[in-house]
Interface confidence: low
């Protein structure tokens, strides 16, 4: 194992780091460690503000998490030659806060991407696809992880945050080999009905820990190897009967449904015999109503119709949506 | 240097339980799946279960499923494996193996030496 | 689950043979096929991965072909140490089910 420990250069992030000169086989940027037996370099916790321009050839999973990078431009790992063994990219809680299209062109082998906890203020509609055809280059990306990726409201954009990923994730149909998106705790109050529909290759999804109140303009129709959905932690008050029915209509799904406020009242009975007759949920057991009053903390699956009933006098903004 | 340490195996009664745990070091334990690979004398090499980097999700064969409890505590770089209700068949050498970039592009790069796990009255 | 079917289940060559196993899955599985050596008593090694790249130290003479249902292991140049069980896997479904190894023997 061989690291490097001297201070980093100051010199202004090259234009094109393709032009720069290549590293030497064993080189080590500095401020990182690099093991060529392990394929890996990390450049943790380094307050990095820019990606080292020569990185080992011979990279296979890199580290670069902890740092202050602010924004990923177009080309920001390509080098010549290119980063091709490259297959796992952790970019994690580097105060990124904005991510051009073309950031991770030239990387033919990356199969994993980490962008968790990052305030991304502005994620570029061709970050993942690097074109703005319609149809891009399919990209290599198999596991793309962008939790607590919301920035502060302070820091939002005009357009909707859930819009602006959405954007990314459907660009040139590029990500149609994806097989595990992670997009938990981004307080998403929803998700743009066409995303998944490019999206067919998905196996896992994990949406847990924001803010979704419904699931009615969600088709998961054609996610037919989806085999885990993650939504505990989220706002839902009822699943009504069309996504009941796409959800036990998926060969092999698992569904995590812990800690949503679910509204017992008659726009609940369709789900609770769906929960009585189904293996798709995990834990359906836990799942307890959170309203009305009256309901509180009974557990869904000892419900009968008889429980379910609407007050008439309920204001319909209480009701389900 | 990445190494895999398991440990806890031995003799145990039918319908007995064990705890196997696999220490790892060497690499930034939290960013990897992690996974169970057992081996009957004489046998082929069978996937038991395995577990994302988060700890968040587990996988199971249908052999050891509600049986068998993967889990995985990353401020100790530990791996555990909760074998309860255990039959003669599950009597095998228990290797803890790591998967290199996540769990559906995977592959295991790394291994440990393994642990003997044996059922027998 | 996907069925993992190798062959031939043993196998015996010579020092300096070009030795070929075969993997078949139950169903496609991409390029999501990794094979493994065991020796008597030792964890499996990683050989290839990805179908067809060759992991790190690994000496040039493995390689790995094919895509879909049909893999194949080829040693180009037997050498003494290469004497031992072979197992491919697939990480395409949700269960990474294994084949039930090539042995390789000494003729």
């Known amino acids: 194992t061989s690291s490097a420990s001297s201070s980093s250069s100051s010199a202004p992030f090259l234009a094109s780091a393709a032009s720069a000169q290549p590293p030497l086989p064993d080189q080590c940027p500095a401020l990182c460690e690099c093991s060529e037996a392990a394929r890996t370099v990390k450049c943790v916790n380094r307050n990095l503000t820019e990606v080292p321009t020569d990185l080992p050839l011979y990279v296979r999973n890199l580290f670069l998490t902890g740092n202050q990078l602010a924004v990923l431009p177009a080309g920001a790992f390509a080098r010549r030659p290119p980063l091709a063994e490259l297959a796992a990219l952790n970019l994690s809680g580097s105060r990124l806060d904005e991510v051009r299209g073309g950031a991770f062109e030239h990387l033919p082998s990356l199969r994993q991407l980490d962008l968790s906890h990052n305030p991304l203020a502005y994620l570029s509609p061709f970050a993942f696809s690097g074109s703005n055809a319609s149809i891009s280059a399919p990209s290599p990306l198999v596991e793309l992880i962008l939790n607590h990726i919301v920035p502060p409201d302070d820091k939002r954009q005009n357009r909707s945050f859930e819009g602006m990923v959405a954007a990314a994730l459907v660009a040139g149909r590029a990500l149609q080999g994806l097989h595990l998106l992670e997009l938990a705790s981004n307080h998403f109050l929803y998700l743009p009905r066409d995303v998944l529909a490019q999206l067919p290759s998905l196996r896992y999804l994990d949406l847990s820990n924001n803010s979704l109140v419904s699931l009615t303009y969600v088709s998961f129709r054609n996610l037919t190897h989806l085999e885990s959905l993650h939504l505990e932690d989220n706002a839902l008050k009822v699943l009504h009967n069309g996504t009941l029915a796409e959800l036990q209509g998926l060969p092999h799904v698992r569904v995590f449904l812990d800690n949503n406020p679910w509204v017992c009242d008659c726009h609940m009975a369709d789900m609770v015999t769906w929960l009585k007759q189904t293996g798709v949920v995990q834990g359906k057991d836990r799942l307890t109503c959170a309203f009305p009053e009256k309901m509180r903390n009974r557990v869904l699956l000892e419900l009968n119709s008889a429980d379910l009933d609407c007050d008439p006098i309920l204001p319909p903004s209480l009701q389900t949506s | 240097e990445v190494q895999l340490l398991e440990s806890g195996g031995g003799l145990v009664q039918p319908g007995g339980s064990l705890r196997l745990s696999c220490a790892a070091s060497g690499f930034t334990f939290s960013s990897y799946a992690m996974s169970w690979v057992r081996q009957a004398p004489g046998k082929c090499l069978e996937w038991v279960s395995a577990i994302s980097g988060s700890g968040g999700s587990t996988y199971y064969a249908d052999s050891v499923k509600g049986r068998f409890t993967i889990s995985r505590d990353n401020s100790k770089n530990t791996l555990y494996l909760q074998m309860n209700s255990l039959r003669a068949e599950d009597t095998a050498v228990y290797y803890c193996?790591?998967?290199?970039?996540?769990?559906?592009?995977?592959?295991?790069?790394?291994w440990g030496q393994g642990t003997l796990v044996t059922v027998s009255s | 689950d996907i069925q993992m079917t190798q062959s031939p289940s043993s196998l015996s060559a010579s020092v300096g043979d070009r030795v070929t196993i075969t993997c078949r899955a139950s169903q496609s599985i991409s390029s999501y096929l990794n094979w493994y050596q065991q020796k008597p008593g030792k964890a499996p090694k990683l050989l290839i991965y990805a179908a067809s790249s060759l992991q790190s130290g690994v000496p040039s003479r493995f390689s790995g072909s094919g895509s879909g249902t049909d893999f194949t292991l080829t040693i180009s140049s037997l050498q003494p140490e290469d004497f031992a069980t072979y197992y491919c896997?697939?990480?395409?479904?949700?269960?990474?089910?294994f084949g039930c190894g090539t042995r390789l023997e000494i003729k």
């Open positions: 896997q697939q990480t395409y479904g949700y269960l990474h089910t």
């Open positions: 193996a790591r998967y290199y970039g996540g769990y559906y592009s995977a592959w295991m790069d790394y």
